[in-house]
Each structure stands twice: as structure tokens, then as C-alpha cells.
Interface confidence: low
């Protein structure tokens, strides 16, 4: 009696079972009752990932350097290329298939957390006590100057963009 | 607000079949992929089926393939398991739950299963 | 299939304490655009189950500031900074990085 399934790493063709082809080879031809499944490699530019009956191997990811990606990792015959994106930016979703720009913290905002190829900047607003006047990936919020510690009063208060003044004790005349 | 509701369940022999629905509300059914997850008494979960948004894709638990089937009705906002030859290991609570996502820059990014039904009872008896 | 393994089963905590759960993947989860691929689920006696966690530390909305995941590839945790009564339950961590999707046997946080 002809199968109804097969075994794991097999497929059912012409109520027989055939073995299926490795990782990193395609399908020429099933097997028959006298000869057995005929695979060859994939080619340099492809891959296959599973053991399979594909009759085409699957072409590796493209990076494409105009819209931000590199090679992460080269694909192999059984593994597809891995792109991740340039210094300064970072992907656009899960499958990375484009890359973005890393957000600047604007002036009162400070960053939270640096980007990464995966992730964008993550920034915060600077609390009392602390200031950011530039447009930054990479800054945090600063705390204002301490003017007593310089031995001076503050003239102007600071802001979430602004340090405070500092400036000369008023002497008081005899 | 958003919600599943689960019905179809009760007591069934061994070898019979049952049909459980799941009824979506509150939110647009036909953009989210969809799982049946099920708990035996006193046990943990465990993973039944899961249906793309359009209901191309489908993929079963070894445990239930060739006797279960996941289909969903966009049209009706509606989610069902057919479930054939019933065994008495079958007998737990099915929940309807959906695959979360939220779209960002014009892409999807998995948020979790972030909606779970009631749960609806399957009891298999002699 | 990818297995989860979490420790404690069974974990009794004083309100106002820290509780940690384990959950140990058979494989890495970790997936090449740098997202972990691990939630966590609670479910609290007699309801259905919610998520907590999702893609290994983001927290689902709604879900307190306590609660707070972390890890990557196949070591994660989930901490509770400060238990509370209505915490009490069933935590479990599940894989969605590949499918059939599979859940940690699930650790029983009860009141000390």
C-alpha cells in the first residue's frame, strides 16, 4: 500500500516518499522508484535555508547602500545576508529593509538613551536643575552651573535651555 | 471597547467533532493575525493554531494537525476552530487571542498577543 | 521545537519584596534586527491570561512600572520590584520567534 505520509526529511511525490534536499541545495529531480532525489548547491548570490524541495534557490538580501544599509553578516548557501545600517542611523522596521536617520534632541530635551542600528535616539526633557541648548544625538541634559561654588551669585535663572548667570556678589558699602 | 468572545464549547465523546467561534469586536479584525491557545485543567498554556490577517497562512500544533482546523470570516469579524475525532487530552479551556502589532514609519512591529478572550470549556467524555 | 524552562515553579512573597522569575530558552531568541523575541504573560486565578511583556523589556499598556523584563538570547528575566496582593498568579514566558509558538511551564507567585 502506497504511503499517506513520510518520514521527517522526506516528501510524498508519486505515492512514494523522497528525500528532501539539504540546506544550501535545490531540486533537480524527485526520486523514482530506482533512483534517489537529485539536488545541487545553490549558486554564491543564493540560498536555501531548510531542508526543501524547491526547484530554485532564493537569491541573498541586497544591502543597499542608498538607502543606509551594510552588510551585518555575508549570507552563506544555507543562511540569507543580514543588513544592518550605517553610523547615524538606524532601521525602519523589523525586517530592516531601509534605514533612517537618528532624531536629534532638540534644545530643553536631552538624550535618554543613544541610538543604535536598531533603535532610535530616545530623548527626554531636562528637569529643573538641568539644560540642553543644542540640537544633539548624542548629548544628555547638563545641570546648570553651580555659582556658589565659584563663589558667585546667579544674575539670571536658567531654563531647560539655558544655563543660569553667574556674576559678582553685590558688596554691600559701609 | 476591543474584545473576543469565545463560544461553541461543551461535552463531547471521544472521535465526535465541535466547532468553536470567537467573535472580535472593537477593533478592525481583517489587519491582525489570529491564535487559538489552550490550558487542560490545572495545567499550563499551550499553543493551538495561528491565521494570517487574510487567512493564507495557517499553521497547527502537532499535536492537533490533520484533526484541527483554524479558519477565520473577515466579513463576519469572526474566528473558528473545527476540530474533528475529539480525544479526551483535547479537554481544556480554548482561547481566542490576537497577535498584537503597532504601525510605525509604515510598519508593523509585534506587540505581543495583546488580547485575550474568556475562554470557552471542551469537555471529551465517554 | 523550542523549549522553555522557567525556575521557580513556585515562588511565596511578602508584599512590599522583590520577586524574579527565570525563563531559559533552548535556543537563542534573540533575531538579527536585535529584537528579543520573548514575551511574558500573567494570569491572575480564575481569568484569562494577560500580557505583561512584550519583545523581551517592553512593557504592554496599562501594565505598572513595577513589572519590568529584561535578557537576551536564551537567559531573560522578569522582575517585580515591589509585590503586591493583586500580582498574585500565574507568570509565563512564551516564544514568538518561531512557530509552533511554546509557553514556559509557568511559576505560581503566591502571598507569604
Known amino acids: 500500500e502506497p504511503p499517506t505520509a513520510c518520514r521527517e526529511k522526506q516528501y510524498l511525490i508519486n505515492s512514494q516518499c523522497c528525500s528532501l534536499c539539504q540546506p544550501g541545495q535545490k531540486l533537480v529531480s524527485d526520486c523514482t522508484e530506482f533512483t534517489e532525489t537529485e539536488c545541487l548547491p545553490c549558486s554564491e548570490s543564493e540560498f536555501l535555508d531548510t531542508w526543501n524541495r524547491e526547484t530554485r534557490c532564493h537569491q541573498h538580501k541586497y544591502c543597499d547602500p542608498n538607502l543606509g544599509l551594510r552588510v551585518q553578516q555575508k549570507g552563506t548557501s544555507e543562511t540569507d545576508t543580514i543588513c544592518t545600517c550605517e553610523e547615524g542611523l538606524h532601521c525602519m522596521s523589523e525586517s530592516c529593509e531601509s534605514c533612517v536617520p537618528h532624531r536629534s534632541c532638540l534644545p530643553g530635551f536631552g538624550v535618554k538613551q543613544i541610538a543604535t542600528g536598531v533603535s532610535d535616539t530616545i530623548c527626554e526633557p531636562c528637569p529643573v536643575g538641568f539644560f540642553s541648548n543644542v540640537s544633539s544625538a548624542f548629548e544628555k541634559c547638563r545641570p546648570w552651573t553651580s555659582c556658589e561654588t565659584k563663589d558667585l551669585v546667579v544674575q539670571q535663572a536658567g531654563t531647560n535651555k539655558t544655563d543660569v548667570v553667574c556674576g559678582p556678589q553685590d558688596r554691600q558699602r559701609a | 471597547q476591543v474584545q473576543l468572545v469565545e463560544s461553541g464549547g461543551g461535552v463531547v465523546q471521544p472521535g465526535r467533532s465541535l466547532r468553536l467561534s470567537c467573535a472580535a469586536s472593537g477593533f478592525t479584525f481583517s489587519s491582525y493575525g489570529m491564535h487559538w491557545v489552550r490550558q487542560a485543567p490545572g495545567k499550563g498554556l499551550e499553543w493551538v493554531a495561528v491565521i494570517s490577517k487574510d487567512g493564507g497562512n495557517k499553521y497547527h500544533a502537532d499535536s492537533v494537525k490533520g484533526r484541527f482546523t483554524i479558519s477565520r470570516d473577515n466579513s463576519k469579524n469572526a474566528l473558528y476552530l473545527q476540530m474533528n475525532s475529539l480525544r479526551v487530552e483535547d479537554t481544556a479551556v480554548y482561547y481566542c487571542?490576537?497577535?498584537?502589532?503597532?504601525?510605525?514609519?509604515?510598519?508593523?512591529?509585534?506587540?505581543?498577543?495583546?488580547?485575550w478572550g474568556q475562554g470557552t470549556t471542551v469537555t471529551v467524555s465517554s | 521545537d523550542i523549549v522553555l524552562t522557567q525556575s521557580p515553579l513556585s515562588l511565596p512573597v511578602t508584599p512590599g519584596e522583590p520577586a524574579s522569575i527565570s525563563c531559559r530558552s533552548s535556543?537563542?531568541?534573540?533575531?538579527?534586527?536585535?529584537?528579543?523575541?520573548l514575551d511574558w504573560y500573567l494570569q491572575k486565578p480564575g481569568q484569562s491570561p494577560q500580557l505583561l511583556i512584550y519583545?523581551?523589556?517592553n512593557r504592554a499598556s496599562g501594565v505598572p512600572d513595577r513589572f519590568s523584563g529584561s535578557g537576551s538570547g536564551t537567559d531573560f528575566t522578569l522582575k517585580i520590584s515591589r509585590l503586591e496582593a493583586e500580582d498574585v498568579g500565574v507568570y509565563y514566558c512564551m516564544q514568538a520567534l518561531q512557530t509552533p509558538r511554546t509557553f514556559g511551564q509557568g511559576t505560581k507567585v503566591e502571598i507569604k
Open positions: 519583545l523581551g523589556s
Open positions: 535556543q537563542s531568541l534573540l533575531y538579527s534586527n536585535g529584537y528579543n523575541f
Open positions: 487571542v490576537r497577535r498584537g502589532h503597532q504601525l510605525v514609519l509604515g510598519y508593523y512591529y509585534y506587540n505581543g498577543l495583546d488580547v
